[in-house]
Amino acid sequence: PEPPTACREKQYLINSQCCSLCQPGQKLVSDCTEFTETECLPCGESEFLDTWNRETHCHQHKYCDPNLGLRVQQKGTSETDTICTCEEGWHCTSEACESCVLHRSCSPGFGVKQIATGVSDTICEPCPVGFFSNVSSAFEKCHPWTSCETKDLVVQQAGTNKTDVVCGPQDRLRA
C-alpha cells in the first residue's frame, strides 16, 4: 500500500518507496530501493543545483560574457549559480542580467534623481523652478540658481531649467 501521508519533506515517492531527494550541489544517479538510499553525485566544476532535487543533470553556471558588458559579481558554487553584473558605466537590461546597456545621461533641464547601479538605470527628474542643469550627465543633480541677493547683486537675466540666473551690479542713482 501507499504510505499514509505520501512522503516527508525532502523525499519523493517512487515504486512505493519514499526516497531521499539529493541535497543541493548533488544530482541523482539512481533512485532508492528498499535496501539502498538514493544514490547522488556531486555536480561537476562549473555546474550547480540549488535545491533538494531528483535531477539527473546539474545546471551549467551562467557565463558572464564580457562582449555583452558583463562581469562576475559572485562566483558560482555547486549549490549556487554565478551572479553577473555589468561593467562600470553600464547596467543590466533585465533582472536575469543577460546583457548590459550604457547608463543613460540626464539631458540639460534634467538632473539625476538616482545614480545608476549595475542593475538599474539612471533616474532623471526635471529641474524644478529655482534649479537648473546645463549639461548632459549621468551623475549631476539639478543645481539651485545663484542667489544674486546674497552677493549684493541683482538678477539681470532670469534663470531657466537649463540656465542659471545672470547677476549684475545694482543701478546707482546719479546726482
Epitope: 499514509p4 519514499c18 539502498t36
Partner: antibody
Framework: EVQLVESGGGLVQPGRSLRLSCAAS????????MHWVRQAPGKCLEWVSG????????HYADSVKGRFTISRDNAKNSLYLQMNSLRAEDTAVYYC????????????????WGRGTLVTVSS | DIQMTQSPSSVSASVGDRVTITCRAS??????LAWYQQKPGKAPKLLIY???YLESGVPSRFSGSGSGTDFTLTISSLQPEDFATYYC?????????FGCGTKVEIK
Amino acid sequence: EVQLVESGGGLVQPGRSLRLSCAASGFTFDDYAMHWVRQAPGKCLEWVSGISWSSDSIHYADSVKGRFTISRDNAKNSLYLQMNSLRAEDTAVYYCAKDPTATTGARGYFDLWGRGTLVTVSS
Amino acid sequence: DIQMTQSPSSVSASVGDRVTITCRASKVISSWLAWYQQKPGKAPKLLIYAASYLESGVPSRFSGSGSGTDFTLTISSLQPEDFATYYCQQHSSFPPTFGCGTKVEIK
C-alpha cells in the same frame, strides 16, 4: 509531548524469551517506520530490526534473524520485539527509535529515540 | 555491512573549545550520514542528517561536513551541556551501521 517509552526488559536465562514494548505518543505513529537498536555494555550501537508503517517491510540484523520478531499495533501506537532463544550476547540496552520516513524497515536514520530498557541474559 | 570508524574514541576539551570528530565509512555512502549525541542514561538525540543538515532545534554551533567516505562533526564553541558521547551512522544501505562513539570529556 513527543516521546517513546520502552518496557519489558529484565533478567532472563539463556534460551528463554522476552517481549519488549514501546509506547509512542505525541506524533502520528502509523505515518512512520520504526526500529529497534541495542547497545551492549561498553559496545557500539547495533541496529536490530525495522518495520515499515504498514508492516509490509520487515528486516532483521543477521545476529537476531530467526530468533527475534518485530511487530506493531498502529491502533495502540505500540511497537514490539519478541525475543526468543536469548543468548548472553543479547545482553544490552534496547532502544525503540522512530524513522523520519514511512516506507522501509531496512535502512534509515532515527529522529526520535526512547531512553531504552535493559535486557540481561544470564544464568 | 558498511563499517563506520570514528576517531578519536575520546577527547578532552574545555568550554569554548572547537571540537572536531571524524567518521570514516568502509564504502562510499554519498552524503547519507547522521550524527547523534547521547548523555548517560538518556535517549540518543539526532543532531545532523544527510551529512550536513542540522535537525530542527539543534544549536548552530554544531555542523557536519563531508561526503563519500570521510565525514566530520564540529562543535564550534563547546558548551557545558555538550559533554556527551557522539555517534555517526550511515543510512545509505542495509543494514544501518554505527560508529562506536567519541566521548567528549571535560579537560
